[in-house]
Structures are given as C-alpha cells and as structure tokens.
Interface confidence: low
Amino acid sequence: AGHLEQPQISSTKTLSKTARLECVVSGITISATSVYWYRERPGEVIQFLVSISYDGTVRKESGIPSGKFEVDRIPETSTSTLTIHNVEKQDIATYYCALWEV
C-alpha cells in the first residue's frame, strides 16, 4: 500500500511570496496514483483544492481563483507539489495530501 509523508510540519511565509508544499509518496509508483490536496482553515471544515490524476489530469475545485494553486507530480522524486501563489492571510491553513491508488 502507498504511504504519504509531508516533510514540512509547518511553514511561515512572507505575504505575496510563493509557497511550495511537498507530499512524498512511497510504497507505490506515483505515476500510478492520483494525489489530492485539501486545506483546513482554522475553525472551518476541510476543503478539496486540487488533484492530479495518474494520467496527469488536473482537477480544481470551482470557486478557487484561477492561478492560485498549481499541482504537479515529479516522478524523479516521487513527490507531488502544491504551489500557492501570492500568499495572503486567507491562505493560513493546514494543507493535507491524500492518495488514491488506481
């Protein structure tokens, strides 16, 4: 079975900068999985943000500003990355990655 690890326990960002979060997949080939990213803002329910499927298809939650989040999968490092552009106060949250094995 696949295993997920998010190396950065916490991240402090300067406003307007770009944050890149990592999710390392082990125990299974990342190219044969779909990776989902979620965020949980303080006091709010967890929310789906974006996913990248085994075939590279990216799906984003409607209502999220275009270009705000970019998701990718890097086979060389078996890592999925979530890039958050133009970091602002509304982006303060806990971000989770999840795995769907095909």
Epitope: Q8, K13, R20, D72, P75, E76
Partner: antibody, heavy 125, light 109 residues
Framework: EVQLVESGGGLVKPGGSLRLSCAGS????????MNWVRQAPGKGLEWVSS????????YYADSVKGRFTISRDNAKNSLSLQMNSLRAEDTAVFYC??????????????????WGQGTMVTVSS | EIVMTQSPGTLSLSPGERATLSCRAS???????LAWYQQKPGQAPRLLIY???SRATGIPDRFSGSGSGTDFTLTISRLEAEDFAVYYC??????????FGQGTKVEIK
C-alpha cells in the same frame, strides 16, 4: 543531463521583431518557473521576464513591459520570448534560466540553478 | 524597486588570498531571498549561494555567504585560479521579482 538550449537570436533592425526559444531537457520542465535574463555587451545581468509553472503568473522588467511577451509550452518542454518594437538598447546575450523558486521549509529562495548558453540579439540599422 | 549595489567594482588579489565581496540593498531584504552567481568570460552565470548562506550543488566549501537586512557578503577563503571571474548578487522580491547587482570582478593581481 539537465540542459537548457536557447535559439532564435540574430540581427534585427530597430522597430523589428524576434522570437527566442529555449528547449529544456533532462528534468521535469513543467515543475519549474522559468526566466529570461539578458546581458548587454560588457555589462551586468538584467532580469527580463519570468513565468510560473502553469503560466498563471507572468512578470516583466519595466524596460520591456508592453514590448516583450513570455510564454511556455510544457508539452514541448519549451520557453519562448516574443520581442517586438526592438531598440538598440535591447542588444544583448539572452539567457533562459530555470528557477527553483521558494522553498517552504526554511523559507528561502533557491535561485536560478540551471542556465542556457545564451543567444545573441543585435539591434542595429 | 530594490537596488543592489556591489563593491568593490574590481578586486585584485593573488591566488591563495581571501576575497570579500559586498552587496548592499537599497532597502531591507530577507536573507532568505538572496543569491550569488559566478560568471566567467563567454560563459553563462553559475549559481553559487542561495538563501544568503547555502551553497548550491557542487560548489566548493571555500565559498561562503553571510549577511542580513541590507548588507550581504560573499567570501572566498582561498582563491584558486578558476575563481577569477565576475560575481553577482541577486535578490528575489515581488516588484520586480528579481534584481541583480552590477557585479564585482575578481582579477589576478
């Protein structure tokens, strides 16, 4: 081998246009922000433009804003710079450079870690 | 716009000597967002230091970076023949995203 190769430079008259290309190989091109940096003869480095991984964020130096357009094709691992209304002061070697962006853990800038060999653009009548 | 000013313009030293290059920002820059590059004649620049003090892959430990706020330093502890080149500092910001210093040439005395 991780590599960037620029092409498209040459001699052009003032007011003319030129399109530069940069081909990436040996790495997952779509995962990196990309930049164009230029260097006039005998001068220092000048950042020209940058583009984010999915082209959602694009920036230009004031000196080229409105005249240059950066774009990328992740399916072809290529970066382009369309240069219009060229001026004599645009004469320079143009480099494309890979940008590793901002690291989250530790919060630091990784820098431009891979550069092409450069392509010369000469604007003269 | 943040202006990066490097000094001296030229540094004349002998192999084996210590080189100290300065980079000053017109306003405070996070040390996290400061990089140094080396460029030799006819070649593309090469990343040396990122995050003000972290050496890039393959860079020898005679190169070190330090500083914070507006003042940053690149030190080459013992100059070797291949170290004679031009060095640039660069800051990452948001308007514009990048600014380079004008460069410091390290030449053989």
């Amino acid at each position: 081998e991780v590599q960037l190769v620029e092409s498209g430079g040459g001699l052009v008259k003032p007011g003319g246009s030129l399109r530069l290309s940069c081909a990436g190989s040996g790495f997952t091109f779509r995962s990196y922000d990309m930049n164009w940096v230029r260097q006039a003869p005998g001068k220092g480095l000048e950042w020209v433009s940058s583009i984010s991984t999915s082209s959602g964020y694009i920036y230009y130096a004031d000196s080229v804003k409105g005249r240059f357009t950066i774009s990328r094709d992740n399916a072809k691992n290529s970066l382009s710079l369309q240069m219009n209304s060229l001026r004599a002061e645009d004469t320079a070697v143009f480099y494309c450079a890979r940008d590793r962006g901002i690291a989250v853990a530790g919060d630091y800038y990784y820098g431009m870690d891979v550069w092409g060999q450069g392509t010369m653009v000469t604007v003269s009548s | 716009e943040i202006v990066m000013t490097q000094s001296p313009g030229t540094l004349s030293l002998s192999p084996g000597e210590r080189a100290t290059l300065s980079c000053r920002a017109s306003q405070s820059v996070s040390s996290s967002y400061l990089a140094w590059y080396q460029q030799k004649p006819g070649q593309a620049p090469r990343l040396l230091i990122y995050g003000a003090s972290s050496r890039a892959t393959g860079i020898p430990d005679r190169f070190s970076g330090s500083g914070s706020g507006t003042d940053f330093t690149l030190t080459i502890s013992r100059l070797e023949a291949e170290d004679f080149a031009v060095y640039y500092c660069q800051q990452y910001g948001s308007s514009p995203p990048y600014t380079f210093g004008q460069g410091t040439k390290v030449e053989i005395k």
